[in-house]
């Protein structure tokens, strides 16, 4: 069964910024890639910024950097200021669509008890089924 | 399917300048990277240079201190500023586009040809 994981890291230079890192775990093609944050895209999350492999990147603020790092992994480095500025309890969370096992999404968020610097560790729950 | 054109080659003189540009047709995605290659006749096709969208920029050796690459205020559009130009940078020069940085995917241009002859 394909997965989805979220890692959230909080950076120790920059207390407003984060880093998202996603990844798929799946044998099938991923064709797209959507990062929101304030719950599931199109349940109420905002969209952050969208990969596509064969046609590029396009973020929104407070994103700064979306990028893949693998065939099915992503990061994305949010730099909050202000009323766009991430918390530490923000969710984030990451779709994969993906042929053919369908759309696999995946939140997380920083933990509670995070010193900056530190990241939460890669979580593949909760995993929702989108088709 | 991203559709790449490229404009600015011509005759110059050893010591000139030229300007290329290449305009990419995809518009809503930013294209991860984008550069120029070139092709000497004769010879296999070779990185001159790379620019991504964030702002990272790679130089073939050669070309380092005489050409600068940027990407235009306009959506997926770059440029490469060549000066000092040489006999041997006579070439087809190549807009080259990698939407992802993974290569899964990539997207050329049809040359532009640059001669530097006197």
């Known amino acids: 069964t394909p997965e989805v994981w979220v890692q959230v890291r909080m950076e120790a230079t920059e207390l407003s910024s984060f880093t998202i890192r996603c990844g798929f775990l799946g044998s099938g093609s991923i064709s797209l890639v959507t990062v929101s944050w304030g719950g599931p895209n199109g349940a109420g999350g905002t969209t952050l910024a969208v990969l596509h492999p064969e046609r590029g990147i396009r973020q929104w603020a407070p994103a700064r950097q979306a990028r893949w790092e693998t065939q099915s992994s992503i990061s994305l480095i949010l730099e909050g200021s202000g009323a766009s500025s991430p918390c530490a309890n923000t969710t984030f969370c990451c779709k994969f669509a993906s042929f053919p096992e369908g759309s696999w999404e995946a939140c997380g968020s920083l933990p509670p008890s995070s010193d900056p610097g530190l990241s939460a560790p890669p979580t593949p729950a909760p995993i929702l089924r989108a088709d | 399917e991203v559709q790449l054109v490229e404009s600015g080659g011509g005759l110059v003189q050893p010591g000139g300048s030229l300007r290329l540009s290449c305009a990419a047709s995809e518009t809503y995605f930013d294209l991860y990277v984008m550069g120029w290659y070139r092709q000497a006749p004769g010879k296999d096709r070779e990185l001159v240079a790379t620019?991504?969208?964030?702002?990272?920029?790679k130089y073939v050796d050669s070309v380092k201190g005489r050409f600068t690459i940027s990407r235009g205020d306009a959506k997926n559009s770059v440029y490469l500023q060549m000066n000092s130009l040489r006999a041997e940078d006579t070439a087809v020069y190549y807009c080259n586009a990698d939407p992802s940085g993974l290569g899964r995917k990539v997207y050329w241009g049809q040359g532009t040809m640059v001669t530097v002859s006197s």
């Open positions: 620019i991504t969208y964030t702002g990272s920029i």
